[in-house]
Interface confidence: medium
């Protein structure tokens, strides 16, 4: 460990790795995922994402709107129930768009958790 820390390139490599992780997070839409152990933060995030999703859908921005709704599903305690509601309230093409994005959700959560755990000096 001492050897690693005395390596002059270690800090640069670490900085570079964090930069890559940050970019990967942002690309995957993870930059704003809450701490999943913090129930209050998760609830706040869920409500904000539902609201943003609804707002963007109302403005006709279906792609971004669906992204926010999938974020909400990702942290929802009862995703099946929420999906049923969404199926009833969203136009079929929009709901289909949402379904195509669902397989990546659990991966996002896993990635977010592992990135958080890995981000230790």
């Amino acid at each position: 460990d001492r050897k690693r820390r005395s390596d002059p390139n270690f800090k640069n490599r670490l900085r570079e790795r964090r930069k890559k992780q940050k970019l990967a997070k942002e690309r995957a839409g993870l930059s704003k995922l809450p701490d999943l152990k913090d129930a209050e933060a998760v609830q706040k995030f869920f409500l904000e994402e539902i609201q943003l999703g609804e707002e963007l859908l109302a403005q006709g921005d279906y792609e971004k709107g669906v992204d926010h709704l999938t974020n909400a599903i990702a942290v929802c305690g009862q995703p099946q129930q929420l999906l049923q509601v969404l199926q009833q309230t969203l136009p079929p093409p929009v709901f289909q768009m949402l379904l195509t994005k669902l397989p990546t959700i659990s991966q996002r959560i896993v990635s977010a958790q592992s990135l958080a755990e890995d981000d230790v000096e």
Epitope: L47, Q51, G53, E54, A58, Q59, L82, V85
Partner: nanobody, 122 residues
């Protein structure tokens, strides 16, 4: 989130008129039920008038026939025309925007402006 900015308050003599305006930004204005509430010192905030996205209005009994609420969706603005003002109308007037969630029926989005002071002297 929605930002609401009120204007038009001031000091007026009893029997006079004022027109309050509230400009909304940051959201789809037409989706919201807009309202005016007022709060006198040491008292609860109470409803003055509301107007739905479709234009349906509702008034507190104390202001019926004297106050008129209206909205202009093209300007993202809601107005409160106050006529025949009385000293008891003296309050801070707050603009409110409220919208129910389509997705989560129990959820309502509620936003408030900073308020504008209306003082009616006798």
């Amino acid at each position: 989130a929605v930002q609401l900015v009120e204007s038009g308050g001031g000091l007026v003599q009893a029997g006079g008129s004022l027109r309050l305006s509230c400009v909304a930004s940051g959201s789809t204005f037409s989706n919201f039920v807009m309202g005016w509430y007022r709060q006198a010192p040491g008292k609860q905030r109470v409803l003055v008038a509301t107007i739905s996205s479709g234009g349906s209005t509702n008034y507190a009994d104390s202001v019926k026939g004297r106050f008129t609420i209206s909205r202009d969706n093209t300007k993202n603005t809601v107005y409160l025309q106050m006529n025949s003002l009385k000293p008891e109308d003296t309050s801070v007037y707050y603009c409110n925007a409220r919208r129910g969630s389509v997705i989560v029926p129990t959820l309502a989005y509620d936003y408030w402006g900073q308020g504008t002071q209306v003082t009616v002297s006798s």
